[in-house]
């Protein structure tokens, strides 16, 4: 699986999950998030050669098409597969609120 | 929606579905598919600016991150959203077989 366990331990050029730390205030301008200051959102990148973690029949077909037609601009793209939520603390006036934001952390990638 | 109705009628630079005809024999080397000879598989391409058909909270965050950090390599990617099946005819020996291959035709795209 193209997950953090594999990708963070290997120098993988092809599609894999990459570490990306996002600081809410500095990187997003989100001053309203009090906790955490930031988090590892991670991201997916790298080429998608034929059959590499193909998401659908279409991505398999497109991968083969791209292999046999290297000049073609059409190829699968490395995108998030499994995502996890992130719990944040913010304030509404003086009232603290805790919310779980869904699909915030990329745990694995796929070629789609 | 970034679907064929919209994308095929507009000169859209950003993430959209693009027409792509694939000939089974010539483009994939699949001699075993007898009907159809080929089909419009289509594909997704184009930049994913902030908030453009964002698939998840992560793609929204990543889009904003990329807007505020233009030098960053991390950005959402334009990938298939809705796909449709394709019915094919092939032969096993002298016996004709008809099969519906799932997720073969891209009908719309998203930023993921």
């Amino acid at each position: 699986a193209l997950d953090t366990n594999y990708c963070f331990r290997n120098l993988e050029e092809n599609c894999c999950v990459r570490p990306l730390y996002i600081d809410f205030r500095q990187d997003l301008g989100w001053k309203w998030v009090h906790e955490p200051k930031g988090y590892y959102a991670n991201f997916c990148s790298g080429p998608c050669p034929y059959l590499r973690s193909a998401d659908t029949t279409h991505s398999t077909v497109l991968g083969l098409y791209n292999t046999l037609n290297p000049e073609a601009s059409a190829s699968p793209c490395c995108v998030p597969q499994d995502l996890e939520p992130l719990t944040i603390l913010y304030y509404v006036g003086r009232t603290p609120k805790v919310e779980q934001l869904s699909n915030m952390v990329v745990k694995s990638c796929k070629c789609s | 929606a970034l679907d064929t109705n919209y994308c095929f009628r507009n000169l859209e630079e950003n993430c959209c579905v693009r027409p792509l005809y694939i000939d089974f024999r010539q483009d994939l080397g699949w001699k075993w598919v007898h009907e159809p000879k080929g089909y419009y598989a289509n594909f997704c391409s184009g930049p994913c600016p902030y908030l453009r058909s964002a698939d998840t909270t992560h793609s929204t965050v990543l889009g904003l991150y990329n807007t505020l950090n233009p030098e960053a390599s991390a950005s959402p990617c334009c990938v298939p959203q809705d796909l449709e099946p394709l019915t094919i005819l092939y032969y096993v020996g002298r016996t004709p077989k008809v099969e519906q291959l799932s997720n073969m035709v891209v009908k719309s795209c998203k930023c993921s």
Epitope: - | K31, H34, T87, L89, Y91, G93, R94, P96, V98
Partner: antibody, heavy 119, light 111 residues
């Protein structure tokens, strides 16, 4: 260009034997089924024998009229298909065509070889 | 086995005529939207030639005056404007199941 060249036809007495050969070129012989189709004088086309590719275990078919007397075989290394005809009868007199069916249709045909069974 | 019955067994026509030949199968030779019927032209002393595959697809190099239609059990070969070189015997053939079989043929003669 696809070419199918039959040979081995001729005059033979009833009860005798003949072996027809069909040398193929211009296509991926190993991938496709091969057939023998005949036309007897004043009659229509009849599929006599058929052999599919190695992928499908060289499965064979014979028409009822030739079953247990004719044997179809192929040598993929020589791109050749054969029809061994034993216990020949007068009603086997016909032009025998070698043909290839990549799908459900017989796309290419040889020029035919005449088999005459007569005493 | 699936039997194919062609009609007429022979016909006389003139150059320029529109000619229609039918082929009826003893059971359906269609599967899903695919119609597994094919048509051939056979001239004396020559090998048969594929004209139409899968009911309506023109084989390579075949003039557009030839067309095919039909589904299920009933199929038609049409020559829109008969030419001198079209006088021949025409056969249908199915590939719905093994064994594949041919129709009895339709001989097109000069009137």
């Amino acid at each position: 260009e696809v070419q199918l060249l039959e040979s081995g036809g001729g005059l033979v007495q009833p009860g005798g034997s003949l072996r027809l050969s069909c040398a193929a070129s211009g296509f991926d012989f190993n991938s496709y089924g091969m057939s023998w189709v005949r036309q007897a004088p004043g009659k229509g086309l009849e599929l006599v024998a058929d052999i599919v590719s190695k992928t499908y275990n060289y499965t064979t078919y014979y028409s009822d009229s030739v079953k247990d007397r004719f044997t179809i075989s192929r040598d993929d290394s020589k791109s050749t298909v054969y029809l061994q005809m034993n216990s020949l009868r007068a009603e086997d007199t016909a032009v025998y065509y070698c043909t290839v069916a990549p799908g459900g249709s017989f796309d290419y045909w040889g020029q035919g070889t005449l088999v005459t069974v007569s005493s | 086995d699936i039997q194919l019955t062609q009609s007429p067994s022979s016909l006389s026509a003139s150059v320029g005529d529109r000619v229609t030949i039918t082929c009826r199968a003893s059971q359906s030779v269609s599967i899903s939207r695919f119609n597994l019927m094919h048509w051939y032209q056979h001239k004396p002393g020559k090998q048969p030639k594929l004209l139409i595959y899968r009911a309506s697809n023109l084989a390579s190099g075949v003039p557009s005056r030839f067309s095919g239609s039909g589904s299920g059990t009933d199929f038609t070969l049409t020559i829109s404007s008969l030419q001198p070189e079209d006088f021949a015997t025409y056969y249908c053939q199915h590939s719905r199941e093994s064994p594949w079989t041919f129709g009895g043929g339709t001989k097109v003669e000069i009137k």
